[in-house]
Protein backbone atom coordinates (compact mmCIF):
# COMPACT_ATOMS: atom_id res chain seq x y z
CA UNK A 1 0.00 0.00 0.00
CA UNK A 2 1.18 3.55 -0.60
CA UNK A 3 2.76 5.46 2.27
CA UNK A 4 0.27 8.32 1.83
CA UNK A 5 -2.46 8.81 -0.74
CA UNK A 6 -2.79 7.22 -4.15
CA UNK A 7 -2.21 10.14 -6.55
CA UNK A 8 0.12 9.31 -9.42
CA UNK A 9 0.45 10.39 -13.02
CA UNK A 10 2.67 9.90 -16.05
CA UNK A 11 3.66 13.57 -16.21
CA UNK A 12 4.60 16.38 -13.84
CA UNK A 13 5.45 16.28 -10.13
CA UNK A 14 3.58 13.02 -9.57
CA UNK A 15 5.14 11.38 -12.63
CA UNK A 16 7.10 8.14 -12.69
CA UNK A 17 10.29 9.59 -11.18
CA UNK A 18 8.27 10.24 -8.02
CA UNK A 19 6.36 6.96 -7.86
CA UNK A 20 8.81 5.28 -5.50
CA UNK A 21 8.25 7.95 -2.80
CA UNK A 22 4.72 6.70 -2.20
CA UNK A 23 5.12 3.24 -3.71
CA UNK A 24 8.48 1.81 -2.64
CA UNK A 25 8.24 -1.22 -4.95
CA UNK A 26 8.46 1.12 -7.95
CA UNK A 27 12.11 1.68 -7.04
CA UNK A 28 12.70 -1.97 -6.22
CA UNK A 29 13.39 -5.28 -7.91
CA UNK A 30 12.06 -6.92 -11.06
CA UNK A 31 10.58 -3.75 -12.49
CA UNK A 32 8.70 -3.64 -15.81
CA UNK A 33 8.54 -2.78 -18.66
CA UNK A 34 11.88 -3.63 -20.23
CA UNK A 35 13.64 -3.49 -23.56
CA UNK A 36 13.72 -6.86 -25.32
CA UNK A 37 17.08 -7.10 -27.09
CA UNK A 38 19.25 -9.95 -28.26
CA UNK A 39 21.86 -9.88 -25.44
CA UNK A 40 19.32 -10.83 -22.79
CA UNK A 41 17.29 -13.37 -24.77
CA UNK A 42 17.61 -17.11 -24.27
CA UNK A 43 15.61 -19.79 -26.04
CA UNK A 44 13.71 -22.10 -23.70
CA UNK A 45 12.25 -25.19 -25.33
CA UNK A 46 9.96 -25.76 -22.34
CA UNK A 47 7.91 -22.65 -23.21
CA UNK A 48 5.01 -24.39 -24.87
CA UNK A 49 2.00 -22.64 -26.45
CA UNK A 50 -0.55 -21.18 -24.05
CA UNK A 51 -4.21 -22.08 -24.38
CA UNK A 52 -6.80 -19.35 -24.08
CA UNK A 53 -9.89 -20.79 -22.43
CA UNK A 54 -13.23 -19.01 -22.21
CA UNK A 55 -11.92 -16.07 -24.23
CA UNK A 56 -14.92 -16.10 -26.56
CA UNK A 57 -17.29 -13.89 -24.58
CA UNK A 58 -20.98 -13.99 -25.46
CA UNK A 59 -22.47 -10.79 -26.88
CA UNK A 60 -25.52 -11.51 -24.72
CA UNK A 61 -23.37 -10.49 -21.76
CA UNK A 62 -22.30 -7.01 -20.72
CA UNK A 63 -18.74 -6.12 -19.72
CA UNK A 64 -17.81 -2.91 -17.97
CA UNK A 65 -15.45 -0.49 -19.71
CA UNK A 66 -13.99 2.09 -17.31
CA UNK A 67 -11.88 5.22 -17.53
CA UNK A 68 -9.84 4.92 -14.32
CA UNK A 69 -7.87 8.11 -14.91
CA UNK A 70 -4.79 6.21 -16.07
CA UNK A 71 -6.09 4.04 -18.90
CA UNK A 72 -9.24 2.54 -20.33
CA UNK A 73 -9.98 -0.81 -18.71
CA UNK A 74 -12.36 -3.62 -19.69
CA UNK A 75 -13.46 -5.96 -16.90
CA UNK A 76 -13.18 -9.63 -17.82
CA UNK A 77 -15.01 -12.67 -16.45
CA UNK A 78 -13.37 -14.98 -13.93
CA UNK A 79 -14.11 -18.09 -16.02
CA UNK A 80 -11.83 -16.76 -18.77
CA UNK A 81 -8.36 -18.18 -18.11
CA UNK A 82 -4.97 -19.25 -19.42
CA UNK A 83 -4.02 -22.90 -19.54
CA UNK A 84 -0.36 -23.86 -19.78
CA UNK A 85 1.28 -22.09 -16.85
CA UNK A 86 2.10 -23.77 -13.52
CA UNK A 87 -1.28 -22.69 -12.10
CA UNK A 88 -4.58 -21.61 -13.56
CA UNK A 89 -4.57 -17.86 -14.17
CA UNK A 90 -8.04 -16.32 -14.45
CA UNK A 91 -8.67 -13.06 -16.29
CA UNK A 92 -9.58 -9.90 -14.43
CA UNK A 93 -9.21 -7.00 -16.89
CA UNK A 94 -7.51 -5.66 -19.98
CA UNK A 95 -6.24 -2.16 -20.63
CA UNK A 96 -4.03 -0.24 -23.04
CA UNK A 97 -1.05 2.10 -23.07
CA UNK A 98 -0.35 4.62 -25.82
CA UNK A 99 1.50 7.79 -26.82
CA UNK A 100 0.13 10.96 -28.41
CA UNK A 101 -0.80 12.16 -31.91
CA UNK A 102 2.54 13.95 -32.41
CA UNK A 103 4.58 10.99 -31.18
CA UNK A 104 2.48 7.85 -31.61
CA UNK A 105 4.98 5.49 -29.98
CA UNK A 106 3.48 4.56 -26.64
CA UNK A 107 4.14 0.88 -26.05
CA UNK A 108 5.59 -0.03 -22.68
CA UNK A 109 7.88 -2.84 -23.78
CA UNK A 110 10.34 -2.02 -26.51
CA UNK A 111 12.09 -4.36 -28.95
CA UNK A 112 15.74 -3.55 -29.69
CA UNK A 113 15.11 -0.06 -28.36
CA UNK A 114 12.10 0.61 -30.57
CA UNK A 115 8.66 1.53 -29.26
CA UNK A 116 5.51 0.25 -30.90
CA UNK A 117 2.48 2.53 -31.27
CA UNK A 118 0.60 1.09 -28.28
CA UNK A 119 0.34 -1.98 -26.08
CA UNK A 120 -2.51 -4.13 -24.79
CA UNK A 121 -2.27 -5.86 -21.41
CA UNK A 122 -4.61 -8.72 -20.49
CA UNK A 123 -4.26 -9.19 -16.75
CA UNK A 124 -4.81 -12.57 -15.05
CA UNK A 125 -4.45 -13.71 -11.44
CA UNK A 126 -3.49 -17.05 -9.95
CA UNK A 127 -6.93 -18.42 -9.14
CA UNK A 128 -5.55 -21.73 -7.86
CA UNK A 129 -3.93 -19.89 -4.96
CA UNK A 130 -5.91 -16.67 -4.49
CA UNK A 131 -9.60 -15.70 -4.45
CA UNK A 132 -9.32 -12.52 -6.50
CA UNK A 133 -6.92 -10.26 -8.36
CA UNK A 134 -6.41 -7.73 -5.57
CA UNK A 135 -5.41 -10.47 -3.13
CA UNK A 136 -3.09 -12.01 -5.72
CA UNK A 137 -1.50 -8.74 -6.81
CA UNK A 138 1.11 -8.58 -4.06
CA UNK A 139 1.76 -12.30 -3.80
CA UNK A 140 4.49 -14.35 -5.39
CA UNK A 141 3.32 -15.85 -8.71
CA UNK A 142 0.16 -13.82 -8.19
CA UNK A 143 -0.33 -12.30 -11.64
CA UNK A 144 0.22 -13.21 -15.27
CA UNK A 145 -0.07 -10.56 -17.95
CA UNK A 146 -0.28 -11.10 -21.69
CA UNK A 147 1.18 -8.15 -23.60
CA UNK A 148 0.31 -7.44 -27.22
CA UNK A 149 2.42 -4.95 -29.14
CA UNK A 150 0.34 -2.74 -31.43
CA UNK A 151 1.58 -1.07 -34.59
CA UNK A 152 -0.07 1.30 -37.03
CA UNK A 153 -1.37 -0.42 -40.14
CA UNK A 154 -4.72 -1.67 -41.33
CA UNK A 155 -8.08 -1.21 -39.61
CA UNK A 156 -8.72 -3.80 -36.90
CA UNK A 157 -12.42 -4.60 -36.39
CA UNK A 158 -11.75 -6.54 -33.19
CA UNK A 159 -10.05 -3.63 -31.44
CA UNK A 160 -12.88 -1.43 -32.63
CA UNK A 161 -15.21 -3.45 -30.42
CA UNK A 162 -13.51 -1.56 -27.60
CA UNK A 163 -12.66 1.71 -29.34
CA UNK A 164 -16.24 2.29 -30.53
CA UNK A 165 -17.26 2.84 -26.88
CA UNK A 166 -14.54 5.35 -25.96
CA UNK A 167 -16.88 8.33 -26.32
CA UNK A 168 -18.89 7.03 -23.37
CA UNK A 169 -15.86 6.87 -21.05
CA UNK A 170 -14.28 10.20 -21.95
CA UNK A 171 -13.73 11.27 -18.33
CA UNK A 172 -12.31 9.63 -15.24
CA UNK A 173 -14.87 7.51 -13.41
CA UNK A 174 -17.15 7.04 -16.40
CA UNK A 175 -18.19 3.50 -17.27
CA UNK A 176 -19.87 1.93 -20.29
CA UNK A 177 -21.22 -1.50 -21.19
CA UNK A 178 -19.50 -3.43 -23.98
CA UNK A 179 -20.96 -6.56 -25.60
CA UNK A 180 -18.86 -9.66 -25.20
CA UNK A 181 -16.68 -10.68 -28.13
CA UNK A 182 -13.84 -13.09 -28.78
CA UNK A 183 -10.91 -11.62 -26.82
CA UNK A 184 -8.60 -14.04 -28.65
CA UNK A 185 -9.16 -11.84 -31.73
CA UNK A 186 -7.08 -9.17 -29.96
CA UNK A 187 -4.05 -11.47 -29.94
CA UNK A 188 -1.53 -11.58 -32.78
CA UNK A 189 -0.75 -14.35 -35.22
CA UNK A 190 1.43 -17.18 -33.94
CA UNK A 191 0.83 -16.74 -30.24
CA UNK A 192 3.15 -19.71 -29.67
CA UNK A 193 6.02 -17.24 -30.20
CA UNK A 194 6.56 -15.10 -27.12
CA UNK A 195 9.01 -13.56 -24.66
CA UNK A 196 8.74 -14.62 -21.01
CA UNK A 197 10.21 -12.99 -17.90
CA UNK A 198 9.41 -12.24 -14.29
CA UNK A 199 8.62 -8.62 -13.65
CA UNK A 200 6.20 -6.17 -12.09
CA UNK A 201 3.08 -4.13 -12.55
CA UNK A 202 4.00 -1.17 -14.77
CA UNK A 203 1.83 1.15 -12.67
CA UNK A 204 1.89 1.88 -8.94
CA UNK A 205 2.16 0.02 -6.67
CA UNK A 206 4.59 -1.74 -9.09
CA UNK A 207 4.35 -5.08 -7.27
CA UNK A 208 7.08 -7.45 -8.54
CA UNK A 209 4.61 -10.30 -8.88
CA UNK A 210 3.95 -10.56 -12.62
CA UNK A 211 4.78 -13.38 -14.97
CA UNK A 212 5.04 -11.54 -18.29
CA UNK A 213 4.24 -13.05 -21.68
CA UNK A 214 5.00 -10.57 -24.46
CA UNK A 215 3.93 -11.88 -27.85
CA UNK A 216 6.63 -11.68 -30.48
CA UNK A 217 4.34 -10.57 -33.31
CA UNK A 218 2.45 -7.28 -33.21
CA UNK A 219 -1.14 -6.60 -34.22
CA UNK A 220 -2.17 -3.70 -36.39
CA UNK A 221 -4.71 -0.97 -35.87
CA UNK A 222 -5.37 1.87 -38.30
CA UNK A 223 -4.05 5.41 -37.98
CA UNK A 224 -7.64 6.54 -37.34
CA UNK A 225 -8.11 3.98 -34.57
CA UNK A 226 -4.84 4.97 -32.95
CA UNK A 227 -5.76 8.64 -33.18
CA UNK A 228 -9.13 7.91 -31.54
CA UNK A 229 -7.35 6.22 -28.65
CA UNK A 230 -4.90 9.10 -28.33
CA UNK A 231 -7.51 11.86 -28.39
CA UNK A 232 -10.75 10.49 -26.91
CA UNK A 233 -9.95 10.33 -23.22
CA UNK A 234 -9.14 12.52 -20.23
CA UNK A 235 -7.40 11.68 -16.95
CA UNK A 236 -9.68 14.09 -15.11
CA UNK A 237 -13.32 14.06 -14.04
CA UNK A 238 -15.93 15.70 -16.26
CA UNK A 239 -16.29 18.70 -13.92
CA UNK A 240 -12.56 19.30 -13.46
CA UNK A 241 -11.72 22.91 -14.36
CA UNK A 242 -8.27 21.82 -15.57
CA UNK A 243 -8.83 18.86 -17.90
CA UNK A 244 -5.80 16.68 -18.70
CA UNK A 245 -5.67 14.57 -21.84
CA UNK A 246 -4.97 10.87 -21.37
CA UNK A 247 -1.82 10.61 -23.46
CA UNK A 248 1.64 9.10 -23.02
CA UNK A 249 0.36 6.69 -20.37
CA UNK A 250 3.35 4.39 -20.60
CA UNK A 251 6.23 3.83 -18.19
CA UNK A 252 9.83 4.10 -19.36
CA UNK A 253 11.75 0.83 -19.71
CA UNK A 254 13.49 -0.29 -16.52
CA UNK A 255 16.99 -1.57 -15.81
CA UNK A 256 17.31 -5.30 -16.45
CA UNK A 257 20.72 -6.28 -15.13
CA UNK A 258 22.09 -9.81 -14.86
CA UNK A 259 18.80 -11.41 -15.82
CA UNK A 260 17.41 -13.16 -18.85
CA UNK A 261 14.25 -13.05 -20.91
CA UNK A 262 13.28 -16.48 -22.18
CA UNK A 263 11.84 -16.97 -25.65
CA UNK A 264 9.63 -19.73 -26.93
CA UNK A 265 11.17 -19.29 -30.39
CA UNK A 266 14.72 -19.81 -31.58
CA UNK A 267 14.85 -18.82 -35.22
CA UNK A 268 15.87 -15.35 -36.32
CA UNK A 269 13.20 -13.57 -38.36
CA UNK A 270 14.41 -13.25 -41.94
CA UNK A 271 13.29 -11.02 -44.76
CA UNK A 272 11.50 -12.77 -47.60
CA UNK A 273 9.96 -11.48 -50.80
CA UNK A 274 6.65 -11.26 -48.96
CA UNK A 275 8.14 -9.28 -46.06
CA UNK A 276 9.03 -10.49 -42.59
CA UNK A 277 8.26 -14.17 -42.11
Amino acid sequence: APVNGSKWTYFGPDGENSWSKKYPSCGGLLQSPIDLHSDILQYDASLTPLEFQGYNLSANKQFLLTNNGHSVKLNLPSDMHIQGLQSRYSATQLHLHWGNPNDPHGSEHTVSGQHFAAELHIVHYNSDLYPDASTASNKSEGLAVLAVLIEMGSFNPSYDKIFSHLQHVKYKGQEAFVPGFNIEELLPERTAEYYRYRGSLTTPPCNPTVLWTVFRNPVQISQEQLLALETALYCTHMDDPSPREMINNFRQVQKFDERLVYTSFSQVQVCTAAGLS
Epitope: S58, N60, P77, S78, Q174, E175, P179
Partner: antibody
Framework: EVQLVESGGGLVQPGGSLRLSCAAS????????IYWVRQAPGKGLEWVGY????????TYNQKFKGRATISVDKSKNTAYLQMNSLRAEDTAVYYC??????????????WGQGTLVTVSS | DIQMTQSPSSLSASVGDRVTITCRAS?????MHWYQQKPGKAPKPWIY???DLISGVPSRFSGSGSGTDFTLTISSLQPEDFATYYC?????????FGQGTKVEIK
Protein backbone atom coordinates in the same frame (compact mmCIF):
# COMPACT_ATOMS: atom_id res chain seq x y z
CA GLU B 1 -41.43 -21.03 -22.66
CA VAL B 2 -38.80 -18.70 -21.17
CA GLN B 3 -39.86 -17.64 -17.68
CA LEU B 4 -38.53 -15.72 -14.69
CA VAL B 5 -40.40 -15.99 -11.40
CA GLU B 6 -39.60 -13.81 -8.39
CA SER B 7 -40.47 -14.64 -4.79
CA GLY B 8 -39.60 -13.54 -1.28
CA GLY B 9 -41.33 -10.17 -1.08
CA GLY B 10 -43.38 -8.99 1.87
CA LEU B 11 -43.32 -6.65 4.84
CA VAL B 12 -39.91 -5.77 6.29
CA GLN B 13 -39.04 -3.60 9.28
CA PRO B 14 -36.87 -0.51 8.69
CA GLY B 15 -33.23 -1.49 9.21
CA GLY B 16 -34.04 -5.07 8.29
CA SER B 17 -33.03 -7.04 5.23
CA LEU B 18 -34.68 -8.92 2.39
CA ARG B 19 -33.69 -11.87 0.26
CA LEU B 20 -35.51 -12.25 -3.02
CA SER B 21 -35.30 -15.19 -5.42
CA CYS B 22 -35.55 -15.28 -9.21
CA ALA B 23 -36.09 -18.76 -10.67
CA ALA B 24 -35.45 -19.13 -14.38
CA SER B 25 -36.70 -21.79 -16.77
CA UNK B 26 -37.02 -22.48 -20.48
CA UNK B 27 -33.52 -21.50 -21.60
CA UNK B 28 -29.83 -22.22 -21.03
CA UNK B 29 -29.41 -20.45 -17.71
CA UNK B 30 -25.73 -19.56 -17.88
CA UNK B 31 -26.00 -17.94 -21.33
CA UNK B 32 -27.55 -14.70 -20.09
CA UNK B 33 -26.98 -12.29 -17.24
CA ILE B 34 -29.75 -11.76 -14.69
CA TYR B 35 -30.62 -8.18 -13.75
CA TRP B 36 -32.54 -6.83 -10.79
CA VAL B 37 -34.67 -3.73 -11.43
CA ARG B 38 -37.02 -2.11 -8.94
CA GLN B 39 -40.01 0.21 -9.19
CA ALA B 40 -41.25 2.29 -6.27
CA PRO B 41 -45.05 2.83 -6.16
CA GLY B 42 -46.06 5.24 -8.90
CA LYS B 43 -42.43 5.80 -9.89
CA GLY B 44 -40.03 4.83 -12.65
CA LEU B 45 -37.69 1.87 -13.05
CA GLU B 46 -34.32 1.72 -11.31
CA TRP B 47 -31.54 -0.78 -12.00
CA VAL B 48 -29.95 -2.39 -8.92
CA GLY B 49 -27.32 -4.74 -10.37
CA TYR B 50 -26.70 -7.92 -12.32
CA UNK B 51 -25.00 -11.28 -12.08
CA UNK B 52 -23.41 -13.56 -14.64
CA UNK B 53 -24.74 -17.00 -13.66
CA UNK B 54 -21.85 -18.75 -15.42
CA UNK B 55 -19.27 -17.48 -12.95
CA UNK B 56 -21.04 -15.44 -10.26
CA UNK B 57 -19.43 -12.17 -11.36
CA UNK B 58 -21.56 -9.20 -10.28
CA THR B 59 -21.89 -5.56 -11.29
CA TYR B 60 -23.89 -3.07 -9.23
CA ASN B 61 -25.40 0.34 -9.63
CA GLN B 62 -23.06 2.46 -7.47
CA LYS B 63 -26.13 3.68 -5.55
CA PHE B 64 -26.65 0.17 -4.13
CA LYS B 65 -23.02 -0.92 -3.68
CA GLY B 66 -22.44 -2.21 -0.19
CA ARG B 67 -26.16 -2.61 0.52
CA ALA B 68 -27.13 -5.04 -2.24
CA THR B 69 -25.63 -8.47 -2.85
CA ILE B 70 -26.59 -10.60 -5.84
CA SER B 71 -25.74 -14.30 -5.86
CA VAL B 72 -26.63 -17.37 -7.84
CA ASP B 73 -27.29 -21.09 -7.37
CA LYS B 74 -26.63 -22.64 -10.77
CA SER B 75 -27.97 -26.01 -9.68
CA LYS B 76 -31.37 -24.37 -9.07
CA ASN B 77 -31.24 -21.89 -11.97
CA THR B 78 -31.96 -19.23 -9.38
CA ALA B 79 -30.51 -15.79 -8.68
CA TYR B 80 -30.90 -13.96 -5.38
CA LEU B 81 -30.98 -10.34 -4.32
CA GLN B 82 -30.10 -9.59 -0.69
CA MET B 83 -30.58 -6.00 0.50
CA ASN B 84 -29.64 -4.76 3.95
CA SER B 85 -30.37 -1.67 6.07
CA LEU B 86 -33.74 -1.21 4.43
CA ARG B 87 -35.53 2.12 4.58
CA ALA B 88 -39.02 3.25 3.61
CA GLU B 89 -37.66 4.44 0.24
CA ASP B 90 -36.78 0.81 -0.60
CA THR B 91 -40.49 -0.02 -0.77
CA ALA B 92 -40.92 -1.17 -4.37
CA VAL B 93 -41.82 -3.97 -6.72
CA TYR B 94 -38.58 -5.83 -7.45
CA TYR B 95 -38.25 -7.43 -10.89
CA CYS B 96 -35.64 -9.73 -12.30
CA UNK B 97 -35.03 -9.54 -16.01
CA UNK B 98 -32.89 -11.01 -18.76
CA UNK B 99 -31.18 -8.96 -21.46
CA UNK B 100 -30.71 -10.40 -24.92
CA UNK B 101 -28.30 -9.11 -27.57
CA UNK B 102 -29.92 -8.40 -30.88
CA UNK B 103 -28.63 -6.27 -33.73
CA UNK B 104 -25.68 -4.61 -31.98
CA UNK B 105 -27.31 -3.94 -28.59
CA UNK B 106 -29.32 -5.51 -25.77
CA UNK B 107 -32.83 -5.11 -24.54
CA UNK B 108 -34.72 -6.76 -21.67
CA UNK B 109 -36.74 -9.39 -23.47
CA UNK B 110 -38.02 -11.34 -20.46
CA TRP B 111 -39.24 -9.97 -17.11
CA GLY B 112 -40.54 -11.69 -14.02
CA GLN B 113 -43.94 -10.77 -12.64
CA GLY B 114 -42.33 -8.80 -9.82
CA THR B 115 -42.47 -9.18 -6.05
CA LEU B 116 -43.56 -6.37 -3.73
CA VAL B 117 -41.38 -5.40 -0.79
CA THR B 118 -42.89 -3.02 1.77
CA VAL B 119 -40.58 -1.43 4.34
CA SER B 120 -42.64 -0.23 7.27
CA SER B 121 -42.87 -0.51 11.03
CA ASP C 1 -25.01 9.17 -14.39
CA ILE C 2 -26.97 9.83 -17.56
CA GLN C 3 -30.30 11.38 -16.57
CA MET C 4 -33.25 10.54 -18.79
CA THR C 5 -36.01 13.14 -18.95
CA GLN C 6 -39.28 12.12 -20.58
CA SER C 7 -41.87 14.62 -21.63
CA PRO C 8 -44.64 14.95 -21.05
CA SER C 9 -44.91 12.92 -17.84
CA SER C 10 -48.52 12.26 -18.73
CA LEU C 11 -50.85 13.08 -21.58
CA SER C 12 -54.53 12.65 -22.37
CA ALA C 13 -55.42 11.72 -25.91
CA SER C 14 -58.27 10.24 -27.89
CA VAL C 15 -58.37 7.11 -30.00
CA GLY C 16 -57.04 7.97 -33.45
CA ASP C 17 -54.78 10.79 -32.22
CA ARG C 18 -51.13 11.04 -33.14
CA VAL C 19 -49.02 10.94 -29.98
CA THR C 20 -45.37 11.83 -29.56
CA ILE C 21 -43.31 11.11 -26.44
CA THR C 22 -39.80 12.54 -26.13
CA CYS C 23 -36.86 11.34 -24.12
CA ARG C 24 -33.83 13.57 -23.58
CA ALA C 25 -30.57 12.13 -22.23
CA SER C 26 -28.16 14.33 -20.27
CA UNK C 27 -25.28 12.97 -22.37
CA UNK C 28 -25.11 11.40 -25.80
CA UNK C 29 -26.16 7.75 -26.03
CA UNK C 30 -25.76 5.24 -28.84
CA UNK C 31 -29.31 3.90 -28.84
CA MET C 32 -32.54 4.33 -26.95
CA HIS C 33 -34.88 1.49 -25.99
CA TRP C 34 -38.55 1.80 -25.05
CA TYR C 35 -40.78 -0.35 -22.81
CA GLN C 36 -44.54 -0.39 -22.37
CA GLN C 37 -46.03 -1.07 -18.94
CA LYS C 38 -49.64 -1.56 -17.96
CA PRO C 39 -50.88 -1.28 -14.35
CA GLY C 40 -49.90 -4.23 -12.16
CA LYS C 41 -47.81 -5.80 -14.91
CA ALA C 42 -44.11 -6.04 -15.70
CA PRO C 43 -42.70 -3.81 -18.44
CA LYS C 44 -42.65 -5.23 -21.98
CA PRO C 45 -39.95 -4.47 -24.53
CA TRP C 46 -41.48 -2.27 -27.21
CA ILE C 47 -38.80 -0.57 -29.32
CA TYR C 48 -35.11 -1.42 -29.26
CA UNK C 49 -32.10 0.23 -30.82
CA UNK C 50 -33.97 3.53 -31.19
CA UNK C 51 -36.24 2.52 -34.05
CA ASP C 52 -36.60 -1.26 -34.31
CA LEU C 53 -39.99 -2.59 -33.25
CA ILE C 54 -40.11 -5.72 -31.12
CA SER C 55 -41.89 -8.57 -32.89
CA GLY C 56 -45.65 -8.21 -32.40
CA VAL C 57 -45.58 -4.45 -31.80
CA PRO C 58 -47.99 -2.74 -34.23
CA SER C 59 -46.51 -0.67 -37.05
CA ARG C 60 -48.33 2.45 -35.84
CA PHE C 61 -45.49 2.73 -33.34
CA SER C 62 -42.20 4.22 -34.45
CA GLY C 63 -39.03 5.44 -32.81
CA SER C 64 -36.42 7.92 -33.90
CA GLY C 65 -33.63 10.17 -32.68
CA SER C 66 -29.92 10.26 -32.04
CA GLY C 67 -27.41 11.70 -29.61
CA THR C 68 -29.47 13.09 -26.75
CA ASP C 69 -32.96 13.47 -28.24
CA PHE C 70 -35.26 10.56 -28.99
CA THR C 71 -38.96 10.14 -29.67
CA LEU C 72 -41.58 7.42 -29.62
CA THR C 73 -44.53 8.15 -31.89
CA ILE C 74 -47.94 6.47 -32.13
CA SER C 75 -49.45 7.46 -35.47
CA SER C 76 -53.05 6.59 -34.57
CA LEU C 77 -53.72 5.82 -30.92
CA GLN C 78 -55.70 2.63 -30.21
CA PRO C 79 -57.45 1.57 -26.98
CA GLU C 80 -54.78 -1.04 -26.19
CA ASP C 81 -52.02 1.62 -26.35
CA PHE C 82 -53.09 3.31 -23.11
CA ALA C 83 -50.16 2.54 -20.83
CA THR C 84 -46.96 4.02 -19.43
CA TYR C 85 -43.90 4.16 -21.69
CA TYR C 86 -40.32 4.20 -20.43
CA CYS C 87 -37.14 5.00 -22.33
CA UNK C 88 -33.87 3.34 -21.32
CA UNK C 89 -30.19 3.77 -22.20
CA UNK C 90 -27.49 1.15 -22.01
CA UNK C 91 -24.51 3.21 -23.19
CA UNK C 92 -23.22 4.23 -19.77
CA UNK C 93 -23.14 2.70 -16.33
CA UNK C 94 -25.48 2.90 -14.51
CA UNK C 95 -28.06 1.98 -17.10
CA UNK C 96 -30.97 4.34 -16.55
CA PHE C 97 -34.64 4.65 -17.38
CA GLY C 98 -36.79 7.69 -17.93
CA GLN C 99 -39.40 8.49 -15.30
CA GLY C 100 -42.16 7.33 -17.65
CA THR C 101 -44.91 8.91 -19.74
CA LYS C 102 -48.45 7.86 -18.91
CA VAL C 103 -50.79 7.86 -21.92
CA GLU C 104 -54.39 8.23 -20.69
CA ILE C 105 -57.77 8.33 -22.37
CA LYS C 106 -59.20 11.81 -22.81
Amino acid sequence: EVQLVESGGGLVQPGGSLRLSCAASGYSYTDYNIYWVRQAPGKGLEWVGYIDPANGDTTYNQKFKGRATISVDKSKNTAYLQMNSLRAEDTAVYYCSRPIYYGAYWYFDVWGQGTLVTVSS
Amino acid sequence: DIQMTQSPSSLSASVGDRVTITCRASSSVTYMHWYQQKPGKAPKPWIYRTSDLISGVPSRFSGSGSGTDFTLTISSLQPEDFATYYCQQWSSNPLTFGQGTKVEIK
